[in-house]
């Protein structure tokens, strides 16, 4: 049998291999050692007994999509039946105090491979034996501790294969410089050690994508925006656009990256080398946002110019013309660069919203029958932008981290947007007050630290009877700078 007979449904063409040459991989036309690595078709009854205590599942993931020329990494993780795990020596053991259908196991081992590998009969002087080889006959690499690696993974894609000895998790990286663009299929077959041979335990496949478009994602955020994922934002407040380039192998690390923005509001093109940009829409409506990312990436050199036409007279032969009969372009020189582009498009809706909220006054409320440890405080609040429909206050400790009380209530505010919010404080001390005004699309926040002093019933009563002069002197309010913009604050005497 050949590798493609074992690993795939159909014999891949040489054309596929020639157009997708993977460095360090081998042609699946090579012979497969079926004596050492038996081949079972899907549905073969032997699969049922390929692993003690159930079936092993192989999970294949990749960091696709990959920009052509970059590395794509595949990870295979083996998921063992319940209560089984791999120990430090590579043996498969039962987890302590773990119950499966068979109950608790007396034998700690599912597979004790250490005992098998110490039996070194048939080895030659190099410590290499006829069974410590891959399916194509290549010997296992003798990394330190290789004897504790008891799984053989065979990766197969684009008419080529790669063999790897490993433990219950392996990772393989492939350079995509010569890979055809588009979706491709990676298949992995996993074998476990079984005496002097190997037994298939799992097969898995996954689609990966190679692209010549830089994979681009844009996150959009805006202060006071209620829902950042609905692509609806507020007029007259800057929106922060942050570009994330999916480049897990850092292929573009040394590339100059340009970001060309069109915000769709007739403000023209904005070109930047910064991945973050702010933009403020000054009109309501729907706008088409377009981003083009350009990076000079390592790439193949352009083919050399053709030689001048041959003169009509015959020229001496330069030897057999069989070395490069197809005129394949030269292998890319690492110094050559090719411009790669990425695109992002979004339709965003701009609406009115609450732009700013300020506490302009804080007043201690006189209580004719005050509680011994309760204070009522009125916050006079103004806002700009649209009219709020709800107000929320969160009262917390002075660090603004531990919430003590949170209250939301609907409000009916006139167009001047001036409202008074009354809140109770239990006991003296310093409190952080977060006050939020909201409507359907926006939430505007301001914060204040206030100090509520001790007060005994007599003094409260006395202050109440005295007609209210100077009551606000018993506490002071301090502003916290939030969102890097200043609020006006007035102490009222």
């Amino acid at each position: 049998k050949r590798f493609h007979d074992v690993l795939g449904n159909e014999r891949p063409s040489a054309y596929m291999r020639e157009h997708n040459q993977l460095n360090g991989w081998s042609s699946d036309e090579n012979d497969w050692n079926e004596k050492l690595y038996p081949v079972w078709k899907r549905g073969d009854m032997r699969w049922k007994n390929s692993w003690k205590g159930g079936r092993v599942q192989a999970v294949l993931t990749s960091d696709s999509p990959a920009l052509v020329g970059s590395n794509i990494t595949f990870v295979v993780n083996l998921v063992f039946p319940r209560c089984q795990k791999e120990d430090a020596n590579g043996n498969i053991v039962y987890e302590k105090n773990c119950r499966n259908e068979a109950g608790l196991s007396a034998d700690p081992y599912v597979y004790n491979w250490t005992a098998w590998s110490e039996d070194s009969d048939g080895e030659n002087g190099t410590g290499q034996s006829h069974h410590n080889v891959f399916p194509d006959g290549k010997p296992f690499p003798h990394h330190p501790g290789w004897r504790r690696w008891n799984f053989v993974y065979v990766f197969h894609t684009l008419g080529q294969y790669f063999q790897k000895l490993g433990r219950c998790s392996v990772r393989v990286s492939v350079n995509t410089a010569n890979v055809t663009l588009g979706p491709q299929l990676m298949e992995v077959t996993v074998y476990r050690r079984h005496g002097r041979a190997y037994v298939p335990i799992a097969q898995v496949k996954d689609v990966y994508v190679v692209t010549d478009q830089i994979p681009v994602f844009v996150t959009m955020s805006q202060k006071n925006d209620r829902n950042s994922s609905d692509e609806t934002f507020l007029k007259d407040l800057p929106i922060t656009f942050d570009v994330l380039i999916h480049d897990p192998s850092h292929f573009l690390n040394y590339s100059t990256i340009n970001y060309k923005w069109s915000f769709g509001d007739n403000t023209g093109l904005f070109v930047s080398i910064n991945h973050t940009v702010n933009h403020t829409y000054v009109l309501n409506g729907t706008f088409s946002l377009n981003l083009t990312v350009k990076a000079a990436a390592p790439g193949p050199c352009p083919p050399p110019p053709p030689p001048p036409p041959r003169p009509p007279k015959p020229t001496p032969s330069l030897g057999p013309a069989g070395d490069n009969p197809l005129g394949l372009s030269e292998i890319p020189d690492e110094n050559c660069q090719i411009n790669r582009y990425g695109h992002f498009q979004a339709t965003i809706t701009i609406v009115e919203g609450i732009l700013e909220v300020n506490i302009i006054q804080t007043t201690d409320v006189l209580m004719l029958v005050p509680g011994p440890d309760s204070s009522l405080i009125d916050f006079v609040v103004t806002c700009q932008g649209s009219i709020p429909t709800e107000v929320c206050t969160i009262i917390s400790d002075p660090t603004c981290e531990i919430t003590q009380n949170a209250v939301c209530s609907p409000v009916d505010v006139d167009e001047m947007c001036l409202l008074t919010v009354r809140r109770a404080f239990n006991g003296s001390g310093t409190y952080c007050v977060n006050l939020t005004l909201g409507d359907d699309t926006s939430l505007a926040l301001t914060s204040t630290l206030i100090s509520v002093p001790d007060r005994d019933p007599a003094s409260s009563l006395r202050m109440a009877n005295s007609g209210g002069g100077g009551l606000n002197d018993i506490f002071e309010a301090q502003k916290i700078e939030w969102h890097e913009h200043h609020h006006h604050h007035h102490h009222h005497h």
Epitope: S13, V68, T180, L181, D212
Partner: antibody
Framework: QVQLVQSGAEVKKPGASVKVSCKAS????????MHWVRQAPGQGLEWMGE????????NYAQKFQGRVTMTVDKSTSTVYMELSSLRSEDTAVYYC????????????WGQGTLVTVSS | DIVMTQSPDSLAVSLGERATINCKAS??????LAWYQQKPGQPPKLLIY???YRYTGVPDRFSGSGSGTDFTLTISSLQAEDVAVYYC?????????FGGGTKVEIK
């Protein structure tokens, strides 16, 4: 839908060069190799070579090595085939054809460009 | 280069009858073989790829079979619109090569 539109017929003298264009639309241009196939009057089909629009890599048939140059203009989604040192036996209809990803069969063809080489 | 040899050169079949065209490769190209139909003044049209897969929109009277070096295109019931030249092409390796063509006519 996928379309390959070629440039118009050409009449050339022996020894001259001809450059035929093939403009692609309806698919991601850089994702598929483009091939050139020619057909002399009353004859069969003959593969000349291919180009990868993504990076300009080319493979040419030995017969045309040194005489053919395939190029790409990504900005206009156009590939070009230039054949130099023309002789009368180069008189043929030249087709561009798009491959099927990793598979070199051709589901999409240009309409063909007749190149006549005559003194 | 892989040489593709088609037979017969021409074929006359009655309407509704079966037409069979053969294609032989000089080496194993399985399953990378395609079949095309070409009518006068038109580019070729893909019928079958990878030896036996019918391309989208191709009538099911066209079928492909074979493996290794020997392949067959069968038209199970010839229709008037099937009059054309048929070509096989190996898509196993470059240079890609075509058979010489088989002209199908109505008897």
């Amino acid at each position: 839908q996928v379309q390959l539109v070629q440039s118009g017929a050409e009449v050339k003298k022996p020894g001259a060069s001809v450059k035929v264009s093939c403009k692609a639309s309806g698919y991601t241009f850089t994702s598929y190799w483009m091939h050139w196939v020619r057909q002399a009057p009353g004859q069969g089909l003959e593969w000349m070579g291919e180009i990868n629009p993504s990076d300009g890599r080319t493979n040419y048939a030995q017969k045309f090595q040194g005489r053919v140059t395939m190029t790409v203009d990504k900005s206009t989604s156009t590939v070009y085939m230039e054949l130099s040192s023309l002789r009368s036996e180069d008189t043929a209809v030249y087709y561009c054809a798009r491959s099927g990803g990793n598979y070199a069969w051709f589901a999409y063809w240009g309409q063909g460009t007749l190149v006549t080489v005559s003194s | 280069d892989i040489v593709m040899t088609q037979s017969p050169d021409s074929l006359a079949v009655s309407l509704g009858e079966r037409a069979t065209i053969n294609c032989k490769a000089s080496q194993d190209v399985s399953p990378s073989l395609a079949w095309y139909q070409q009518k006068p003044g038109q580019p070729p049209k893909l019928l079958i790829y990878s030896a036996s897969y019918r391309y989208t929109g191709v009538p099911d009277r066209f079928s492909g079979s074979g493996s290794g070096t020997d392949f067959t295109l069968t038209i199970s019931s010839l229709q008037a619109e099937d009059v054309a030249v048929y070509y096989c092409q190996q898509h196993y390796s470059i240079p890609l090569t075509f058979g010489g063509g088989t002209k199908v006519e109505i008897k």
